[in-house]
């Protein structure tokens, strides 16, 4: 007789769960000497164990506790970027800047980025076929968790300035929303962290507005000034020429603005 | 499926150079790497350096100053140049790339490179 098996909104366990975990474990250890002495069996185990035999709608941040353990690694307080809604740009740009880390270049950020897992009750199963939605279902499933943990503590972490980058192309330039707007805002620490400096990206050819003067970056602002951390602002007009100048600091163009 | 050829390796004396080849079916993108990894006789491999869909290159300390990785986009080729070689560099030589989103790693067949007067 066939168990019932519960039916979620979302999409199920991504493929190959376990090996690419594991398999992301391992690239990252070899790549940065500094983590080599991480056991990825241990991560992954760590890893099962905070979602596997339980409800997928009842996984509490206590659960991921002893993977953030054996996931802990420093990052330079004061090289911290935060990112929403812009990931693939974030993500180039600290390829090229190589002393700034957005979460997803961490241990435990690398390990989970675009993923997608969940257990069952009672049952040591990996469920392929679906997964609680954030919306329809409820917050407090797996992934939901994991990354509003990870977020919490990497924004903890952060000191002196913090970059955000921003995409301009939205709606809501500032999603209070967002991980970062209902997770990392909050957890920055006042007494570390001196500024939060946004870099709103522009998607427009010949869009020369001036972004910084928004309505929800001037919300992000008062935000941020009632936490007693100062806030500044920039426009990035060309995200291909920023990234350009990134690479290649003294070519003759990225003297003007970009 | 990515798949891998190397090309390049051979005998040298110390204090020589040799560049190695890598053309891939796959180029370089988002967070996938390309690279190379060496394998002494009785040893573990270990990873030399790679590149990044940016075109950033990392690499190992032991190989730092000596080595470079450049790649050709356009080609899908990723190469080795290995100049001051030592006789501690001696190993078969495997290309690699990595797929950042499948969580798999892919291999050339391996080139034998030999250091040694």
């Known amino acids: 007789v066939p168990r019932w098996r519960q039916q979620w909104s979302g999409p199920g366990t991504t493929k190959r769960f376990p090996e690419t975990v594991l398999a992301r474990c391992v690239k990252y250890t070899e790549i940065h000497p500094e983590m080599r002495h991480v056991d990825c069996q241990s991560v992954w185990d760590a890893f099962k164990g905070a979602f596997i035999s339980k409800h997928p709608c009842n996984i509490t941040e206590e659960d991921y506790q002893p993977l953030m353990k054996l996931g802990t690694q420093t990052v330079p307080c004061n090289k911290i970027l935060l990112w929403s809604r812009i990931k693939d740009l974030a993500h180039q740009f600290t390829q090229v800047q190589r002393d700034m880390f957005t979460l997803e270049d961490t241990l435990l950020g690398y390990l989970a980025d675009d993923l997608t897992w969940c257990g069952e009750f009672n049952t040591s199963k990996i469920n392929y076929q679906s997964c609680p939605d954030w919306r329809k279902d409820c917050s407090n499933n797996p992934v939901s968790v994991f990354w509003k943990t990870v977020s919490r503590r990497f924004a903890e972490a952060a000191c002196d300035v913090v970059h955000v980058m921003l995409n301009g192309s939205r709606s809501k330039i500032f999603d209070k929303n967002s991980t970062f707007g209902s997770v990392e805002v909050h957890n920055l620490q006042p007494e570390k962290v001196q500024t939060l400096e946004a870099w709103v990206i522009h998607g427009g050819r010949e869009d020369s507005r001036d972004l910084c003067q928004d309505p929800t970056i001037k919300e992000l602002e008062s935000i941020i000034s009632k936490r007693n951390i100062q806030f500044s602002c920039k426009n990035i007009y060309r995200p291909d020429k920023f990234l350009q100048c990134v690479k290649n600091p003294e070519d003759s163009s990225c003297t003007s603005e970009i | 499926q990515v798949q891998l050829q190397e090309s390049g390796g051979g005998l040298v004396q110390p204090g020589g150079s040799l560049r190695l080849s890598c053309v891939g079916s796959?180029?370089?993108?988002?967070?996938?790497?390309m690279g190379w990894y060496r394998q002494a006789p009785g040893k573990q491999r270990e990873l030399v350096g790679y590149?990044?869909?940016?075109?950033?290159?990392n690499y190992a300390d032991s190989v730092k100053g000596r080595f470079t990785i450049s790649s050709d986009n356009a080609k899908n080729t990723v190469y080795l140049q290995m100049n001051n070689l030592k006789p501690e560099d001696t190993a078969v030589y495997y290309c690699?790339?990595?797929?950042?989103?499948?969580?798999?790693?892919?291999w050339g067949q391996g080139t034998q490179v030999t250091v040694s007067s």
């Open positions: 690699n790339y990595w797929h950042y989103a499948a969580g798999r790693d892919y």
């Open positions: 796959e180029r370089i993108f988002s967070r996938n790497t």
């Open positions: 590149v990044g869909s940016m075109g950033i290159t």
